[in-house]
C-alpha cells in the first residue's frame, strides 16, 4: 500500500476505561496531530478507518462494527463501547485516508476492574480544595457526549465503599459534591456514579477522583527565610568545612513556582571558581505548604571564603525576599604561655 | 492494632432504651466506618447500621428505622448505639464491627468488638 | 435486598477432612463475597473477602472461589479449632446481608 504519515503509539494518550461501562473515544488525529477538524476532513472526501491489535499480540485487525446491539460502533471521529469488555484492552488505531492523503496514530486502550468500593489500577485526577475557603464544588467528570440533553440521568456520589448522604460537610447536587468548608477530613477518593437510560437499556459511568485540600489563598504569604538569620553566625578557622542551611517555607499557591537559590558575592556558585556544594531537599505539610531547605557547602574553607557575602534568595508568585548568612572568621584563641609570660612582664 | 472494647451486659424491661458503647483504641487511619450488627440466641448475624464518625454520616437497615440511633463521640474514639422501645425478640448479642478505612472492599467488617449482650425481660 | 441461603445448616466432617460450604444469593452479587468464622462465645472471625481472597492470619487450608449467585469455602483438611459457624455476606449492594450459617460439627 501507499505510503501513510504514521504518528505512531501515542502513550500520552494512555486511554483507560472501566469494564462493562460505556466508553466514548475521539481519534486523536484531530485533537493532536492534525490542524484541521473532522468535519472539514470528511467534507475534503477522507474516511476514517479504526482497527486494533489485541494485547499481546502483533496482528492488526478490523474492529467488528457488527457485534450484537451494536456494542462497538464508529460515530462521526469517535468510537463507541455500548458497553467494554474486559478483552477490549489493546492498541487502536484510526487511519483517515483517500486515494492521495494517508494520516494515522495508534492509542493504547486498557479497560479496567473495578471492585465494590471503586478500587482499581485507573490513575486518578486530583481536585484540589482550599482549606476552609467557603463553598467549593468538584464536577462528575468526562461526562459529556454520553446522553442527549434531555436524558436526565441519576448521579450518585460515594466516598469510598459509602454512599454519600449525610455527610456534616459535604452536599451532593446532581453532577456536583459541594463542600460546604473543606477541611482536612475531606481528604480521600470520591466517586461518581451515572446512571442513565438509552434504547431500553441502562447504563452506568463511575468516575473517581481524588481530593486533595490545601492550603487557602487566604492565607497565603510571601516566601518567609528561617535560616540564616540573624541569631546564628556562622564562624569557622581556614581549613574547616563551612555548611550553610537556607530553609525557606513556601504557603500553598496553585500553579506557583516556588525557587530557592544562593548568591556568593552576588554571583550565582556556578558562575564562580570555589568548590561549592548545594544539596536541596523539600517537605510538605498536610495541605501542600512547602519547606525548601538547599545545603550550601565549601569542603575547606579559606579565610578568602569566610568574606564573601553568602546570600539566600526565595521567590514565589507571592514575592521575592533574600537573606544574608553572617560568615566570619573564627579569631584564634591566644596562645596560652605567650599571653603568661606577658603577664608577668617578660620581655 | 485495632481493638474495639464494648460495654457490659444490660437486662431491660420491654419498651425501654438500651445505649451500648464501643471504644476504638490503637493506632488507626482517622476515616473509617463504625458497624453494628445483631445476633440472637442461636441465630446468625443481622446488620443494624453504620457511621462514619469523622464525617457524621450514619445509615440503618430498614428493619430499624425510627427506633435504633448510631452516634459517635470523636474525641473519646467511642461509637454508640442506642435502641429504643425494647422487645423481647430484641435479646440479642450486640456487636461493633470495623474496616481500617472507607476504601477497603470486603473489610468493613475486619475487627470486631467482643460482644455485649442485652436481655430484654419484663 | 439481597438474600443469602448457605446449605448445608449442618455438616458433620471428621478431622482431617475436607468440608464444602455453600453460598447462593438472590441476585449477582459479582465476587463481593466474605466468609466469617464464629466459634460460641465469640465474636465472628473475617476468612475470605472478594470471595477467594483470604484475610491476614488466615491459614492456606481455607479456600473459597465464585462469582455472581454461587459461592463455595472449602475447608481442606479440618482442625480441631475449626469445628465452628461459619457465614457468608454479600457487599455488592446496600443493605449487606449475611446468610443464615452453616454448622459445621465433628462427625
Known amino acids: 500500500s501507499e505510503r501513510c504519515d504514521d504518528w505512531g503509539l501515542d502513550t500520552m494518550r494512555q486511554i483507560q476505561v472501566f469494564e462493562d461501562e460505556p466508553a466514548r473515544i475521539k481519534c486523536p488525529l484531530f485533537e493532536h496531530f492534525l490542524k484541521f477538524n473532522y468535519s472539514t476532513a470528511h467534507s475534503a472526501g477522507l474516511t476514517l478507518i479504526w482497527y486494533w491489535t489485541r494485547q499481546d499480540r502483533d496482528l492488526e485487525e478490523p474492529i467488528n462494527f457488527r457485534l450484537p446491539e451494536n456494542r462497538i460502533s464508529k460515530e462521526k471521529d469517535v468510537l463507541w463501547f455500548r458497553p467494554t469488555l474486559l478483552n477490549d484492552t489493546g492498541n487502536y488505531t484510526c487511519m483517515l485516508r483517500n486515494t492521495t492523503y494517508c494520516s494515522k496514530v495508534a492509542f493504547p486502550l486498557e479497560v479496567v476492574q473495578k471492585d465494590s468500593c471503586f478500587n482499581s489500577p485507573m490513575k486518578l485526577p486530583v481536585h484540589k480544595l482550599y482549606i476552609e475557603y467557603g463553598i467549593q464544588r468538584i464536577t462528575c467528570p468526562n461526562v459529556d457526549g454520553y446522553f442527549p440533553s434531555s436524558v436526565k440521568p441519576t448521579i450518585t456520589w460515594y466516598m469510598g465503599c459509602y454512599k454519600i448522604q449525610n455527610f456534616n460537610n459535604v452536599i451532593p447536587e446532581g453532577m456536583n459534591l459541594s463542600f460546604l468548608i473543606a477541611l482536612i477530613s475531606n481528604n480521600g477518593n470520591y466517586t461518581c456514579v451515572v446512571t442513565y437510560p438509552e434504547n431500553g437499556r441502562t447504563f452506568h459511568l463511575t468516575r473517581t477522583l481524588t481530593v486533595k485540600v490545601v492550603g487557602s489563598p487566604k492565607n497565603a504569604v510571601p516566601p518567609v527565610i528561617h535560616s540564616p538569620n540573624d541569631h546564628v553566625v556562622y564562624e569557622k578557622e581556614p581549613g574547616e568545612e563551612l555548611l550553610i542551611p537556607c530553609t525557606v517555607y513556601f504557603s500553598f499557591l496553585m500553579d506557583s513556582r516556588n525557587e530557592v537559590w544562593w548568591t556568593i558575592d552576588g554571583k550565582k556558585p556556578d558562575d564562580i571558581t570555589i568548590d561549592v556544594t548545594i544539596n536541596e531537599s523539600i517537605s510538605h505539610s498536610r495541605t501542600e505548604d512547602e519547606t525548601r531547605t538547599q545545603i550550601l557547602s565549601i569542603k575547606k574553607v579559606t579565610s578568602e571564603d569566610l568574606k564573601r557575602s553568602y546570600v539566600c534568595h526565595a521567590r514565589s508568585a507571592k514575592g521575592e525576599v533574600a537573606k544574608a548568612a553572617k560568615v566570619k572568621q573564627k579569631v584564634p584563641a591566644p596562645r596560652y604561655t605567650v599571653e603568661l609570660a606577658c603577664g608577668f612582664g617578660a620581655t | 492494632q485495632v481493638q474495639l472494647v464494648q460495654s457490659g451486659a444490660e437486662v431491660k424491661k420491654p419498651g425501654s432504651s438500651v445505649k451500648v458503647s464501643c471504644k476504638a483504641s490503637?493506632?488507626?487511619?482517622?476515616?473509617?466506618?463504625i458497624q453494628w450488627v445483631r445476633q440472637a440466641p442461636g441465630q446468625g448475624l443481622e446488620w443494624m447500621g453504620y457511621?462514619?464518625?469523622?464525617?457524621?454520616?450514619?445509615d440503618y437497615a430498614q428493619k430499624f428505622q425510627g427506633r435504633v440511633t448510631i452516634t459517635a463521640d470523636e474525641s473519646t474514639s467511642t461509637a454508640y448505639m442506642e435502641l429504643s422501645s425494647l422487645r423481647s425478640e430484641d435479646t440479642a448479642v450486640y456487636y461493633c464491627?470495623?474496616?481500617?478505612?472507607?476504601?477497603?472492599?470486603?473489610?468493613?467488617?475486619?475487627?470486631w468488638g467482643q460482644g455485649t449482650l442485652v436481655t430484654v425481660s419484663s | 435486598e439481597i438474600v443469602m441461603t448457605q446449605s448445608p445448616a449442618t455438616l458433620s466432617v471428621s478431622p482431617g477432612e475436607r468440608a464444602t460450604l455453600s453460598c447462593r444469593a438472590s441476585?449477582?452479587?459479582?465476587?463481593?463475597l466474605a466468609w466469617y468464622q464464629q466459634k460460641p462465645g465469640q465474636a465472628p472471625r473475617l476468612l475470605i473477602y472478594?470471595?477467594?481472597t483470604r484475610a491476614t492470619g488466615i491459614p492456606a487450608r481455607f479456600s473459597g472461589s465464585g462469582s455472581g449467585t454461587e459461592f463455595t469455602l472449602t475447608i481442606s483438611s479440618l482442625q480441631s479449632e475449626d469445628f465452628a459457624v461459619y457465614y457468608c455476606?454479600?457487599?455488592?449492594?446496600?443493605?449487606?446481608?449475611f446468610g443464615q450459617g452453616t454448622k459445621v460439627e465433628i462427625k
Open positions: 464491627a470495623r474496616g481500617q478505612t472507607l476504601y477497603d472492599s470486603g473489610r468493613q467488617f475486619d475487627i
Open positions: 490503637g493506632p488507626s487511619n482517622p476515616v473509617y466506618a
Open positions: 457511621i462514619i464518625p469523622l464525617h457524621g454520616q450514619v
Open positions: 441476585q449477582s452479587v459479582s465476587s463481593n
Open positions: 455476606q454479600q457487599y455488592n449492594n446496600w443493605p449487606w446481608t
Open positions: 472478594g470471595a477467594s
